[in-house]
């Protein structure tokens, strides 16, 4: 017997095609067939219009084996058409179809929306032999139905290679709607005017959207969906959700967070990687970003001198890595360095200032009054010069550099001699008899080698020649001297 | 365009109703809600309360419940505010108007003046 | 009930002048709506959800505000702007109407 099976009267199909009947339940039961002793009889429900003339693939059988009568064509019952149920409910149909005893080996498939059901669904035939004819009644079952399960169902059955193949049975699993687009998390410029987006599905239709904002509905008549909620702008963050009506209920949308672009905080943790005497390698923790990408940073690098101007000096640089060589500094010298960056509203304060020192650099002047002669032994160049007039900066002389280039007969030799920073005279062996030597010279701090003199050029002779005359740095803009003897 | 137009005009003597009418036109009337805003004499607006025109539900604000009924013809699109046992602080010009997101009042009918007097 | 508080009740202003018209909500609201009204005339939209000009309505007009402080401002008055103009808040039921500024002509 049905229990609760109520037809219902559709103002429009849900679905293609002719819905022989219509059937909605939270129960749904099937009707009594007449049943052998000891089975438990398949349910199923009765025709929704058994007189209406069937328009699906029939079989049209050829003549009995006796040759007197054709016999009527094969054709499944009519049943119902349209099954509307709540998701999560059990659900139970059929199809039958009567078969006369001369046709052997018959098998019946169910078929969803053109394709074939295989495996492991609840699909049970059953068989109830006559006299004449085979009742075939082919059930499907889904227990706890979900929206997937929505969709057309048709039995089909092969009798000598020919299809027949049932009225479709339409399965609507209806629920709480079913969000397609949430919002969607955003960092919008402030009282600027940006969108929303929000669309549910049943079924049941219609889906009807609320609007909230900070647990305030927006609107406050519903709004067929899809929606777009154009927010007219913001001076502080806010959160946004959208609410799915339909005749089931409601289901709420995640809410997301609508934060306002600011100014980045300011960098903090500046720190000293490596200094050296004009250059100085910092690094920073960036910080908060206003929720908008940083675009570049700004170094500002302050010289702490009294006697300084006070101008800062200010070296762009990209927002990441987090570091930046400082160049073009005085060496031994105290600087105070900030950074700060930007996004696209603006630049963020300046990170707390932090001292560096530059190292004491290299000489940055050579030595001077360079001269250059034999000694009376013939077997020593003696070397005199002046000490350079260095800056603070350069640090404390350590000595001298002394490069002697010896040439002969294309063949040239360089050496390198290191003095102490008391002296300002040296003596050199003579290498090579018959030769050029050309000296220069260059003061040295803990900061490195600083340039070295001009050239100056003494003929060593062959043996047997004397002579004491020097050879001397020139006077800026004359050529290099050259003693000949 | 869009128009909200109301009746005209009400004298009425204390303890009998009135029935204002307020006839939108120029938009899907069910679509958005009609808000009442009463104005007495020399005062200010003072919200009254409103109507949903999709499901015919009236919400009143504090103040507006009993003697005041909100009510809608959605064929053809017109909204009424009913007062009933009128009493002369009744007396005031009501305007309907339309309400959009945020709760803003978009557009305005012309008012109705209902004078309350024995 | 939200509580709008508008002052000046009234201002006196010669065209030309910046008006400055404030309302001050007795809790945080979400956005703030402004209306004109003239003698024996219905209200007319002015500033939607804070800082919006409603359609037709002239840029000397601008809204600003968030929280409890919002404000209305004229930049130079002309004199057709003499008028009450009322607040309106939107965040929670019921919708409630400051009491009103009069701008009156010096």
């Known amino acids: 017997a049905i229990t609760e099976a109520r037809e219902e009267a559709k103002p429009y199909p849900l679905f293609p095609g002719p819905l022989p009947g219509s059937l909605q339940t939270d129960h749904t039961s099937l009707l009594s067939l007449p049943h052998t002793s000891g089975y438990q009889p398949a349910l199923m429900f009765s025709p929704t219009q058994p007189g209406r003339p069937y328009t699906g693939n029939v079989a049209i059988p050829r003549v009995t084996s006796a040759g007197s009568k054709l016999l009527p064509p094969l054709a499944f019952k009519h049943t119902v058409g349209h099954i509307i149920l709540s998701e999560h409910k059990d659900v139970k149909f059929n199809c039958s179809i009567s078969v006369p005893n001369i046709y052997q080996d018959t098998t019946i498939s169910w078929w969803k929306d053109g394709k074939e059901l295989l495996g492991a669904h609840h699909a049970i035939t059953q068989f109830y032999p006559d006299d004449e004819v085979t009742a075939i009644i082919a059930s499907f079952s889904i227990t706890s139905v979900q929206r997937s399960d929505n969709g057309s169902y048709i039995c089909k059955m092969k009798i000598n290679n020919e299809e027949i193949v049932s009225d479709p049975i339409y399965i609507e699993v209806q629920g709480l709607p079913h969000f397609t687009k949430q919002p969607e998390s955003m960092n919008v410029t402030r009282n600027t005017a940006f969108n929303l987006t929000c669309q549910a599905v049943g079924p049941p239709e219609p889906v009807n959207i609320f609007w909230v904002q900070n647990s305030s509905r927006v609107n406050e008549q519903p709004e067929k969906s899809p929606s777009v909620l154009t927010v007219p702008g913001l001076t502080e963050m806010a959160v946004f959700s959208c609410e799915a009506h339909n005749d089931k209920g409601l289901t709420v949308s995640k809410g997301v967070q609508i934060n306002i672009k600011a100014i980045p905080s300011p960098p903090t943790e500046v720190s000293i990687h490596n200094s050296t005497a004009h250059s100085i390698l910092i690094s920073w923790v960036p910080g908060f970003d206003g929720y908008s990408p940083f675009r570049n940073c700004s170094v500002q690098v302050k010289e702490v001198d009294p006697l300084s101007n006070g101008s800062v000096m200010i070296f762009n640089t990209s927002a990441s890595p987090h570091m930046y060589q400082i160049k073009q500094l005085q060496a031994l010298a105290n600087y105070s360095i900030g950074v700060s960056c930007m996004n696209e509203i603006g630049w963020s304060a300046v990170s707390p200032w932090i001292l560096a020192s530059t190292t004491e650099g290299a000489p940055s002047v050579a030595p001077l009054n360079v001269t250059v002669f034999l000694n009376e032994s013939r077997d020593n160049v003696d070397i005199r010069w002046m000490k350079p007039l260095t800056k603070r900066q350069a640090g404390e002389l350590v000595g001298y550099r002394i490069s002697h280039v010896w040439q002969s007969a294309g063949i040239s030799k360089e050496l390198l001699e290191e003095v102490g920073q008391n002296n300002s005279r040296a003596q050199i062996s003579v290498q090579v008899h018959n030769a050029t030597c050309t000296v220069r010279i260059a003061a040295v701090t803990k900061g490195g080698v600083g340039p070295f003199s001009d050239p100056v050029k003494i003929f060593i002779p062959a043996h047997g020649w004397v002579d004491h005359a020097p050879s001397s740095t020139p006077a800026p803009g004359n050529a290099d001297p050259v003693l000949i003897i | 365009q869009v128009q909200l137009v109301q009746s005209g005009s009400e004298l009425k003597k204390p303890g009998a109703s009135v029935k204002v009418s307020c006839k939108a036109s120029?938009?899907?009337?069910?679509?958005?809600?009609v808000h009442w805003v009463r104005q007495a004499p020399g005062q200010g607006l003072e919200w009254m309360g409103w109507?949903?025109?999709?499901?015919?539900?009236?919400t009143y604000a504090q103040g507006f419940t009993g003697r005041f009924v909100f009510s809608l013809d959605t064929s053809v699109s017109t909204a009424y505010l009913q007062i009933s046992s009128l009493k002369a602080e009744d007396t005031a010009v009501y305007y309907c108007?339309?309400?959009?997101?945020?709760?803003?009042?978009?557009?305005w009918g012309q008012g109705t003046l209902v004078t309350v007097s024995s | 009930e939200i509580v709008l508080t508008q002052s000046p009740a009234t201002l006196s202003l010669s065209p030309g002048e910046r008006a400055t018209l404030s309302c001050r909500a007795s809790?945080?609201?979400?956005?703030m709506h402004w209306y004109q009204q003239k003698p024996g005339q219905a209200p007319r939209p002015l500033i939607y959800?804070?800082?919006n000009l409603a359609s037709g309505i002239p840029a000397r007009f601008s809204g600003s505000g968030s929280g409890t402080s919002y404000t209305l401002t004229i930049s130079s008055l002309e004199p057709e702007d003499f008028a009450v103009y009322y607040c309106q808040q939107w965040s929670s039921n019921p919708r409630t109407f400051g009491g009103g500024t009069k701008v009156e002509i010096k």
């Open positions: 109507i949903n025109t999709y499901q015919g539900e009236p």
């Open positions: 120029g938009y899907t009337f069910a679509n958005y809600g």
């Open positions: 959800a804070t800082s």
């Open positions: 108007t339309r309400g959009a997101r945020y709760a803003y009042m978009d557009y």
């Open positions: 809790s945080s609201v979400g956005y």
